[in-house]
């Protein structure tokens, strides 16, 4: 788990307890079983603008 008091990871990244830092979710392409990849899979998709009011 991310240490209390630390800033959340930016969009497109996820916290790695193994590395003690936020990791770019793109890195899951190299190693899909990295611990932070679970957070990447669970992250909601980027918000989109509705096409109607």
């Amino acid at each position: 788990e991310q240490a209390p008091g630390t800033a959340p990871c930016s969009r497109g990244s996820s916290w790695s307890a193994d590395l003690d830092k936020c990791m770019d979710c793109a890195s899951c392409r190299a190693r899909p079983h990295s611990d932070f990849c679970l957070g990447c899979a669970a992250a909601p998709p980027a918000p989109f603008r509705l096409l109607w009011p």
Partner: antibody, heavy 120, light 112 residues
Framework: QVQLQQSGPELVKPGASVKMSCKAS????????IAWVKQRTGQGLEWIGE????????YYSEKFRGKATLTADKSSNTAYMQLSSLTSVDSAVYFC?????????????WGQGTTLTVSS | DIVMTQAAFSNPVTLGTSASISCRSS???????????LYWYLQKPGQSPQLLIY???NLASGVPDRFSSSGSGTDFTLRISRVEAEDVGVYYC?????????FGGGTKLELK
């Protein structure tokens, strides 16, 4: 350039322990995993486990849990593997390897191997 | 654990001809992200293993393009288009889909 320099050959008696080293250079030690792999003479490659040097977090093969202990010293950029309660089946060449975590995949780098002989 | 299976020996090959080495995995190495996590290593006599191919079909840095790899989720083939003397050694397939990291038993490339 990336280099992994492993310690020299070891001759130890059955029942004893041994600690071998893998000194990394040419990259940021804490940014990559160090894995350890066993190879008995004329045999294949067997993953023992791996360590994240920055945090010391480890993952082990079930087969080697209790046999191998992986540690890392950030101040000297060195990873260590201790093997305990040695028997003849532990006689092998042991490799350390740097494994990537990043999307710009740049391959694995291997040390030259440490030969362990367990004999009375 | 994922079991990687290889034949112990290849058919003896003549220098300058092509060679193929096969590998099978007990579980599909095709991830939902579209990448197949199959890797090939070559261990030359008296040396450490060296990466040849990553993610099934990508050539590692410095590896000649005589080497190529293809396959499905579970069946894979490494092809050497023009075998040279320096290609002799043991070829290992491995996966990087999950832990534990497992290797095939290795296929020894022999020359005629």
């Amino acid at each position: 350039q990336v280099q992994l320099q492993q310690s020299g050959p070891e001759l130890v008696k059955p029942g004893a322990s041994v600690k071998m080293s893998c000194k990394a250079s040419g990259y940021t030690f804490t940014d990559f995993i160090i894995a350890w792999v066993k190879q008995r003479t004329g045999q294949g490659l067997e993953w023992i486990g791996e360590i994240y040097p920055g945090t010391g977090r480890t993952y082990y093969s079930e087969k080697f849990r209790g046999k191998a202990t992986l540690t890392a010293d950030k101040s000297s950029n060195t990873a260590y593997m201790q093997l305990s309660s040695l028997t003849s089946v532990d006689s092998a060449v042991y490799f350390c390897a740097r494994r990537t975590i990043y999307y710009d995949y740049d391959g694995d780098y291997w040390g030259q191997g440490t030969t362990l002989t367990v004999s009375s | 654990d994922i079991v990687m299976t290889q034949a112990a020996f290849s058919n003896p090959v003549t220098l300058g001809t092509s060679a193929s080495i096969s590998c099978r995995s007990s579980k599909s190495l095709l991830h939902s992200n579209g990448i197949t996590y199959l890797y090939w290593y070559l261990q030359k006599p008296g040396q450490s293993p060296q990466l040849l191919i990553y993610q099934m079909s990508n050539l590692a840095s410095g590896v000649p393009d005589r080497f190529s790899s293809s396959g499905s989720g579970t069946d894979f083939t490494l092809r050497i288009s023009r075998v040279e003397a320096e290609d002799v050694g043991v070829y290992y397939c491995a996966h990087n889909l999950e832990l534990p990291w497992t290797f095939g038993g290795g296929t020894k490339l022999e020359l005629k």
